[in-house]
């Protein structure tokens, strides 16, 4: 006669997290008398999953009624599968004794758990950078299984190529994490730009997960400064204009200095947005020429987003403005810091 066989027909079973897994096991004989036990893993450290004879296993139910006469089907169903349940499960026949004696094991069934990746989280640089600089964005997603995963980066719909991606751990694990870094070269037009991290996985059925980051959080567009003087008014006052254009973000402080002394400080607020997402701001200063004997040196000082101040200075020539006549003299630029220095 043939000796007892413990048959586990499937070498592997793959189940989605949250579903139930059925692990099949049949025996070829009811003899010898003794229980079937299910273990995860082999060797001394194996974990008992189910014991027909005794114990309470709330997530495990036998597929067939184990008390049924002549039952030789010892398949089990494990409910609410999580990635932690992954492993190789062995159906083991014991011979009745004190203690029971292990008689024969099935070949094992490897349970792999298909777990969805978490929503990708995209983080940008800690500090803003200006156009022509390269910034890095990081995308992270966790808890997925199996290990195979695809991650792509897009900027305004165009795929990025300067990308470095790692999936951890390198060896076998119940679940995996992915971390990817994309390097993006900024342009002045990127205030409205967006980077997208797109993750595709077998569990997502062709509907990838996306994480986004707005470049507006990463970019600083420094202002252009232009100072002009309007024509003399009848009351001997000169209207001087400081035009601050194409800057982002809005956080900007403008200070007027007359001959080095602070005349007025203003903070930009509630400015209308340009089409490209930048802002413009114009500030006026009225200078009473008749109150000055000498030329007046005016400075428009702009501090943008915590960066070092940018100045535009010019002189109003008092001698060029006889009190009885008005003229349209252009401002004389004495300091022409066109750019911030970083």
């Amino acid at each position: 006669e043939e000796e007892l066989q413990v048959i586990q027909p499937e070498k592997s079973v793959s189940v989605a997290a949250g579903d139930s897994a059925t692990l099949n096991c049949t025996v070829s004989s009811l003899i010898p008398v003794g229980p079937i036990q299910w273990f995860r893993g082999a060797g001394p450290g194996r974990e008992l999953i189910y014991n027909l004879k005794e114990g309470h296993f709330p997530r495990v139910t036998p597929v067939s009624d184990p008390t049924k006469r002549n039952n030789m089907d010892f398949s089990i169903r494990i409910s609410n599968i999580t990635p932690a349940d992954a492993g190789t499960y062995y159906c083991v026949k014991f011979r009745k004794g004190s203690p029971d004696v292990e008689l024969k094991s099935g070949a094992g069934t490897e349970l792999s758990v298909r777990a969805k990746p978490s929503a990708p989280v995209v983080s940008g640089p800690a500090v803003r950078a200006t156009a022509e600089h390269t910034v890095s964005f990081t995308c992270e997603s966790h808890g997925f299984s199996p290990r195979d995963i695809t991650l792509k980066w897009f900027k305004n719909g165009n795929e990025l190529s300067d990308v470095q991606t790692n999936v951890d751990p390198a060896g076998k694990s119940v679940s995996y994490s992915i971390r990817s870094t994309a390097r993006v070269v900024l342009t002045r037009r990127d205030v409205h730009s967006q980077v997208i991290c797109e993750v595709a996985h077998v569990t997502l059925q062709g509907d990838p997960l996306r994480g986004t980051a707005n470049l507006s959080e990463a970019i600083r567009v420094p202002p252009f400064l232009e100072v002009t003087q309007q024509s003399m008014r009848a009351d001997n006052q000169v209207n001087v204009t400081c035009q601050v254009t194409k800057f982002y973000p809005q956080r900007l402080q403008l200070t007027w200095l007359e001959n080095g002394n602070v005349s007025r400080t203003e903070m930009a607020s509630a400015l209308p947005e340009n089409k490209d997402g930048t802002y413009n701001w114009t500030s006026w200063l009225l200078v009473n020429v008749s109150a000055h004997r000498d030329d007046v040196k005016l400075t428009c000082q702009v501090e943008h987003d915590g960066q070092p101040a940018v100045n535009k200075s010019f002189s109003v020539k008092v001698s060029a403005h006889p009190k009885e006549q008005g003229s349209n003299t252009a401002a004389e630029n004495t300091g022409t810091n066109e750019r911030n220095i970083y």
Epitope: I31, V33, N70
Partner: antibody, heavy 115, light 111 residues
Framework: RQLVESGGGLVQPGGSLRLSCTAS????????ISWVRQAPGKGLEYIGT?????ITYFASWAKGRFTGSKTSSTAYMELSSLRSEDTAVYFC????????????WGQGTLVTVSS | DIVMTQSPSSLSASVGDRVTITCQAS????????LAWYQQKPGQAPKLLIY???TLATGVPSRFSGSGSGTDFTLTISSLQPEDFATYYC???????????FGQGTKVEIK
């Protein structure tokens, strides 16, 4: 689906006997066959179970005097060194106890040990 | 070896009565449930009624039920029928595979 015993009869003390248990309607290959006896007017007494190869076991009182074997259709039990107290009806039943209880049973065969 | 003690050894009852037979093991039976009940009528082979302490065998009327665990077990016939007058045996299994012992039997007679 039944079991039929045979081989019983009159035997002298110290003698031997071979009992047969033949299955019809099912195979014995995946089941144990257990033997139970009942002395006249007495209760049931478990003797042993015949499985496959090494998987054959007998109650402590029956070890050494009783042995067994089995094919896919017939189980055998050899009774040796018989004594008068072995006089009983011998039943065979399919099963090995616990989750494989004794069912069905044969009709029994009477063994009489007497000089 | 495990010793099974049945009580009572005999009882008289009428049709329709509720009958209870107990079986006590000298030690916990294997798996706390290695206990079967058999019915035997004169001149016949025993018949399986209950196994694994409380599982009703196929074809057995539902008036028969088994309960208990460890060392103490009960067979109950909820409403005795004429065909139920017979001798009832418990069979307990110890931890050793050859350690199977019948109780001495309970004879149920007509009152």
């Amino acid at each position: 689906r039944q079991l039929v015993e045979s081989g019983g009869g009159l035997v002298q003390p110290g003698g031997s006997l071979r009992l047969s248990c033949t299955a019809s309607g099912f195979s014995l290959s995946s089941h144990g066959i257990s033997w139970v006896r009942q002395a006249p007017g007495k209760g049931l007494e478990y003797i042993g179970t015949i499985g496959t190869g090494v998987i054959t076991y007998f109650a402590s009182w029956a070890k050494g005097r009783f042995t067994g074997s089995k094919t896919s259709s017939t189980a055998y039990m050899e009774l040796s060194s018989l004594r008068s107290e072995d006089t009983a009806v011998y039943f065979c039943a399919r099963g090995s106890a616990w989750n494989d209880p004794f069912d069905p049973w044969g009709q029994g065969t009477l063994v009489t040990v007497s000089s | 070896d495990i010793v099974m003690t049945q009580s009572p050894s005999s009882l008289s009852a009428s049709v329709g009565d509720r009958v209870t037979i107990t079986c006590q093991a000298s030690q916990s039976v294997y798996g706390n449930n290695d206990l079967a009940w058999y019915q035997q009528k004169p001149g016949q082979a025993p018949k399986l009624l209950i196994y694994l302490a409380s599982t009703l065998a196929t074809g057995v009327p539902s008036r028969f039920s088994g309960s208990g665990s460890g060392t103490d077990f009960t067979l109950t016939i909820s409403s005795l029928q004429p065909e139920d007058f017979a001798t009832y045996y418990c069979l307990g299994g110890g931890d050793d595979e050859a350690d199977n012992t019948f109780g001495q039997g309970t004879k149920v007679e007509i009152k």
